[in-house]
């Protein structure tokens, strides 16, 4: 499997989608894990309702939602309220039975936020009265690991 | 009719080669996950991989990785079982079974089977 | 591998006897077994899958209990028609396997 990267701005929410054939994993619930060391397993964070007909119905563990369109075939993770500690590999899956089969391996990324004035330095940020309070912005780029990159740091 | 149809009964000398078919009919062939399941003369039930015909994705149990060759050619509605050498160990009967995930309990379970083909490997 | 034993190996009972099957698995496997009877000759059919749900077309006669590692199949009136042979399996995990099987002869 491919690592795709999802990038999230600190404090928004980010969503990460992953697309399956719908007739191979027809039945199966779904779940999002992060993976714990390169070689380590992947503990499960949150999955699909206990019954596959209300798949569609959002799941929430803490700041997690997971959401599946099982006739699309996709999906969807949301992590709200993104932090600095979100950051790592983790794993789309399908399951049958105990056992789980990866349908996307996604690395999330965290970017600070340039609006944040702890790390802003000169950047501008709104006063009182230009507040985003109302705005829900979601922020979610994409993109394959490039041949060679590793998503975990070496280690000897 | 839900239908899986296997090939005839083979006589063979140990060493060759062979390829058994299972023909499925009925239902939308490329959907369902398809099963090889052996039976030795008086004996119980082996499983030995399993394939989903939509892309080719296999799974060998491990007593059987290496040994056996599942393939299915979707545009035909079969799958096959094959051996490069057999022995008179491979002597058999094998069944073909579509797996069918219940959406109870996201489980697969093999709710048709092919009628088996039986086959003899004696020198 | 989940090894998967039944017993008795074989049972002779009489048409309209009540019969009891037991599986076990060597280790937990939640809801995760079906159950398979096979005549001479003959594939396999299934009768119950997740471990108490009755396949479509099967009496209403056989009925499957059990959680974890211990599981049963009860035939409440035996019927000619049921003397075969009896598979439990597990779909908990890769490699699937199935229990040596339960002989259901006529007394």
């Known amino acids: 499997h491919n690592t795709t990267v999802f990038q999230g701005v600190a404090g928004q929410s980010l969503q990460v989608s992953c697309p399956y054939d719908s007739m191979k994993h027809w039945g199966r619930r779904k779940a999002w894990c992060r993976q714990l060391g390169e070689k380590g397993p992947c503990q499960r964070v949150v999955s699909t309702h206990n019954l596959w007909l209300l798949s569609f119905l959002r799941r929430w563990n803490g700041s997690t939602a997971i959401t599946d369109d099982t006739l699309g075939g996709t999906l969807t993770i949301t992590l709200r309220n993104l932090q600095p500690h979100d950051a790592g590999l983790y794993q789309c899956q399908s399951l049958h039975g105990s056992e789980a089969d990866t349908l996307r391996k996604v690395l999330v990324e965290v970017l600070a936020d340039p609006l944040d004035h702890r790390d802003a330095g000169d950047l501008w940020f709104p006063g009182e009265s230009e507040s985003f309070e109302d705005a829900h912005v979601e922020h979610s780029i994409s993109r394959s690991l490039l041949e060679g990159e590793i998503p975990f740091p070496p280690t000897s | 009719e839900v239908q899986l149809v296997q090939s005839g009964a083979e006589v063979k000398k140990p060493g060759e080669s062979l390829k058994i078919s299972c023909k499925g009919s009925?239902?939308?062939?490329?959907?369902?996950?398809i099963a090889w399941v052996r039976q030795m003369p008086g004996k119980g039930l082996e499983w030995m991989g399993t394939?989903?015909?939509?892309?080719?994705?296999?799974r060998y149990s491990p007593s059987f990785q290496g040994q056996v060759t599942i393939s299915a050619d979707k545009s035909i509605s079969t799958a096959y079982l094959q051996w490069s050498s057999l022995k008179a160990s491979d002597t058999a009967m094998y069944f073909c079974?579509?797996?069918?995930?219940?959406?109870?309990?996201?489980?697969?379970?093999?709710?048709?089977w092919g009628q088996g083909t039986l086959v003899t490997v004696s020198s | 591998d989940i090894q998967m034993t039944q017993s008795p190996s074989s049972v002779s009972a009489s048409v309209g006897d009540r019969v009891t099957i037991t599986c076990r698995a060597s280790q937990g496997i939640s809801s995760w077994l079906a159950w398979y009877q096979q005549k001479p000759g003959k594939a396999p059919k299934l009768l119950i899958y997740?471990?108490?749900s009755l396949q479509s077309g099967v009496p209403s006669r056989f009925s499957g209990s059990g959680s974890g590692t211990d599981f049963t199949l009860t035939i409440s009136s035996l019927q000619p028609e049921d003397f075969a042979t009896y598979f439990c399996q597990q779909a908990d995990s890769l490699p699937r396997t199935f229990g040596q099987g339960t002989k259901l002869e006529i007394k």
């Open positions: 079974a579509r797996q069918r995930t219940f959406f109870y309990d996201s489980s697969d379970y093999f709710d048709y």
């Open positions: 997740a471990a108490s």
């Open positions: 009925g239902y939308s062939f490329q959907s369902y996950w």
């Open positions: 394939i989903y015909p939509g892309d080719s994705d296999t």
